[in-house]
């Protein structure tokens, strides 16, 4: 019996579904009835899934594979591999077995992008020409393993005292951490490109280092007091002035913003010119009144990474430094509401209903109410779970005892954006049944 | 010739603190990935935290939060410091040059950390 | 956690012979590139002395007695022929994902 895969490897991202295809050729009068179909491991001979006797006997990795049951008999063998994960990666056998048998492999390669790389530089103040620098380019959660080339302003390749270093991490996708030495000149930028082999994924990260003058004295810088709330996703303004003496020409001012904490280089303005963001390519600046003593910065799409301190440095002849804050937020979702068990239900049961609200930020406050508006603080264990941006997902759980009938309803609280986000289950009749209801959220004041 | 020299260690009363150093020389400190790695009594060793730069450290979760690594790359050294300090946390504990894929290349003679009433 | 266990706990092997150490992971440690198994040496008062990275590389100045076999679970540390200044703790440890951990050791004695 024949039975045929892809030549190529089947790539796939992780976090995503794959189809590892195979395929037969039925004769006439086939029926399900006569078909054994086997997925399994190549390696290791461990079951994966398989159709005998008639019907689908289901998953035995994970239950996270299926089959495409409509199009089995018309010679369709195909897996479907859902969530893939870094341990998936390997070489799958489909054994298909009619009268004859046959059987074939076919290789799954999984791939995960890189991040957008950030540059530090160490030291990263009162820099000379002639210093010795330590620039490091960091990407993160790629897979397999990346290739960094690092290049001059001009895009000449810099290949002496270079160390890359790949440090896996919880999931088993790599960070690469690549670590340049060199020699300052009179200014310079340098560029780190980290390439995933397999999807042919390139991410670039640069850093302009222009060595200082001596300042002396001091410039008054004015940031806001409070801090700036931004939305994930959405671009925030940082806002920092100074006040421009009489005279004052644009070749003389250096402008840095960094982060307070790391010193890690954010966006410049030195000799007269925009260097550039050295934060993922997501800042620029007022180009037009920076003349006028704005300095501020925008940064787009927001993550929550990016909370935090923010210092803008300006220096003229003399120079001054002030830090503003950032303050990430994300409203939470519609709260999504179930119940366990949920039905054959009597008075006096207990339930447990959940509350489920998605992708907020910061952590989110969680208050249940009864049907009155009374609260409800017994039995309640909220947990929260980041994911994979950092944005967490709040889950209420309420253990009650049934009444004769009810309403609860839970309340998503947004600290930040002082945003609320309401769900309610009512119980009813005899046997019970339940209706869920979402309410749009609205902001509390 | 690489040379990791470890100092700082010695009796602490649980609960309390203890700030390990290490001085490296011999090779450029601060192109390299450093870790601190641990054995026990029983001569069980056990990874404790690693960094890159300043801003990028690696750590076991059971290590998170009571250990900090750090690093002087202007003088070269490698520091550790420990807080709330339990008896499990007695070990000789080793600095170490990381490989390019986190082997542990090259390590120092350690310090003895004992932690006892 | 990925764990590592070390068989046999202990060994015995006479001058000239073969030493065989194995070393078995609860998950596979290897990708299609590479795998993430490497073994020390550890004399007593001494700091364990990195000996094979990437499962079957030798550090440099290691001697070429000394050898590192296997994928996926299952690796081996072998020493032909053993010689007396080979008596020591031998430990695996993997770097694929965090944390990182070592084998429980396996000492080696020389008769």
């Known amino acids: 019996l024949e039975v045929q895969v892809p030549e190529d490897p089947v790539v796939a991202l992780v976090g995503t579904d794959a189809t590892l295809r195979c395929s037969f050729s039925p004769e006439p009068g086939f029926s399900l009835a006569q078909l054994n179909l086997i997925w399994q491991l190549t390696d290791t001979k461990q079951l994966v899934h398989s159709f005998t006797e008639g019907r689908d006997q289901g998953s035995a990795y994970a239950n996270r594979t299926a089959l495409f049951l409509d199009l089995l008999a018309q010679g369709n063998a195909s897996l479907r591999l859902q969530r893939v994960r870094v341990a998936d990666e390997g070489s799958f056998t489909c054994f298909v077995s009619i009268r004859d048998f046959g059987s074939a492999a076919v290789s799954l390669q999984v791939a995960a992008p890189y991040s957008k790389p950030s540059m530090t530089l160490e030291p990263n103040k009162d820099l000379r020409p002639g210093d010795t620098v330590t620039i490091t380019c960091s990407s993160y959660r790629g897979y397999p393993e990346a290739e960094v080339f690092w290049q001059d302003g001009q895009g000449a390749p810099l290949t002496g005292n270079v160390t890359t270093s790949q440090m896996a991490n919880e999931q088993g996708l790599f960070d690469v951490h690549s670590v340049l030495r060199v020699v300052l000149g009179a200014n310079g930028t340098y560029s780190c490109l980290v390439r995933n082999p397999v999807l042919q994924q390139d991410a670039h990260g640069s850093i302009t280092i222009t060595p200082q003058r001596s300042p002396t004295g001091a410039v008054e810088v004015q940031v806001p007091e409070d801090p700036v709330v931004a939305l994930v996703g959405t671009d925030a303004t940082l806002r920092c002035s100074f006040s421009p003496e009489p005279g004052f020409s644009l070749a003389q001012l250096n402008l840095i913003w960094q982060l307070t904490d790391t010193k890690q280089l954010v966006h410049s303005f030195t000799e007269g010119r925009d260097q550039g963001s050295a934060y993922a390519n997501r800042t620029a600046l007022f180009l037009d009144l920076l003349a006028q003593g704005n300095a501020s910065l925008r940064l787009q799409r927001v993550r929550v990474a990016d909370e935090g301190s923010f210092t803008c440095f300006v220096s003229i002849r003399d120079f001054g430094s002030a830090a503003v804050s950032l303050q990430v937020a994300a409203p939470y979702s519609k709260p999504s509401m179930t119940l366990e068990p949920n039905k054959d239900l009597r008075p006096g049961d207990t339930v447990t209903i959940t509350c489920s609200s998605y992708r907020g930020y910061p952590e989110a406050e969680v208050f249940w109410q009864d049907g009155q508006g009374a609260p409800l603080t017994g039995n309640v264990t909220t947990s929260q779970m980041a994911n994979e941006q950092g944005l967490f997902d709040v889950h209420s759980v309420l253990r009650v005892v049934l009444g004769a009938n009810g309403t609860y309803s839970c309340l998503v609280r947004n600290p930040v954006l002082q945003q609320d986000a309401h769900g309610s289950v009512t119980i009813t009749g005899q046997p019970m049944t339940f209706a869920a209801a979402h309410h749009h959220h609205h902001h509390h004041h | 010739e690489v040379k990791l020299v470890e100092s700082g260690g010695g009796l602490v009363q649980p609960g309390g603190s203890l700030k390990l150093s290490c001085a490296a020389s011999g090779f450029t400190f601060s192109s390299y990935i450093m870790s601190w790695v641990r054995q026990t009594p029983e001569k069980r060793l056990e990874w404790v935290a690693s960094?890159?730069?300043?801003?990028?450290?690696y750590y076991p979760d059971s290590m998170k939060g009571r250990f900090t690594i750090s690093r002087d790359n202007a003088r070269n050294i490698l520091y550790l410091q420990m807080s709330s300090l339990k008896s499990e946390d007695t070990a000789m504990y080793y600095c170490a040059r990381s490989g390019t894929r986190a082997w542990f290349a090259y390590w120092g003679q350690g310090t003895l950390v004992t932690v006892s009433a | 956690d990925i764990v590592l266990t070390q068989s046999p706990a202990s060994l015995a092997v006479s001058l000239g012979q073969r030493a065989t150490i194995s070393c078995r992971a609860s998950?596979?440690?290897?990708?299609?590139?590479?795998?993430?198994m490497h073994w020390y040496q550890q004399k007593p008062g001494q700091p364990p002395k990195l000996l094979i990275y990437l499962a079957s590389n030798l550090e440099s100045g290691v001697p070429a007695r000394f050898s590192g076999s296997g994928s996926g679970t299952d690796f081996t540390l072998n020493i032909h022929p053993v010689e007396e200044e080979d008596a020591a703790t031998y430990y695996c440890?993997?770097?694929?994902?965090?944390?990182?951990?070592f084998g429980g050791g396996t000492k080696l004695e020389i008769k």
């Open positions: 998950k596979s440690v290897s990708t299609s590139a590479y795998s993430y």
């Open positions: 440890q993997h770097s694929r994902e965090l944390p990182y951990t």
């Open positions: 960094i890159v730069s300043s801003n990028i450290t």
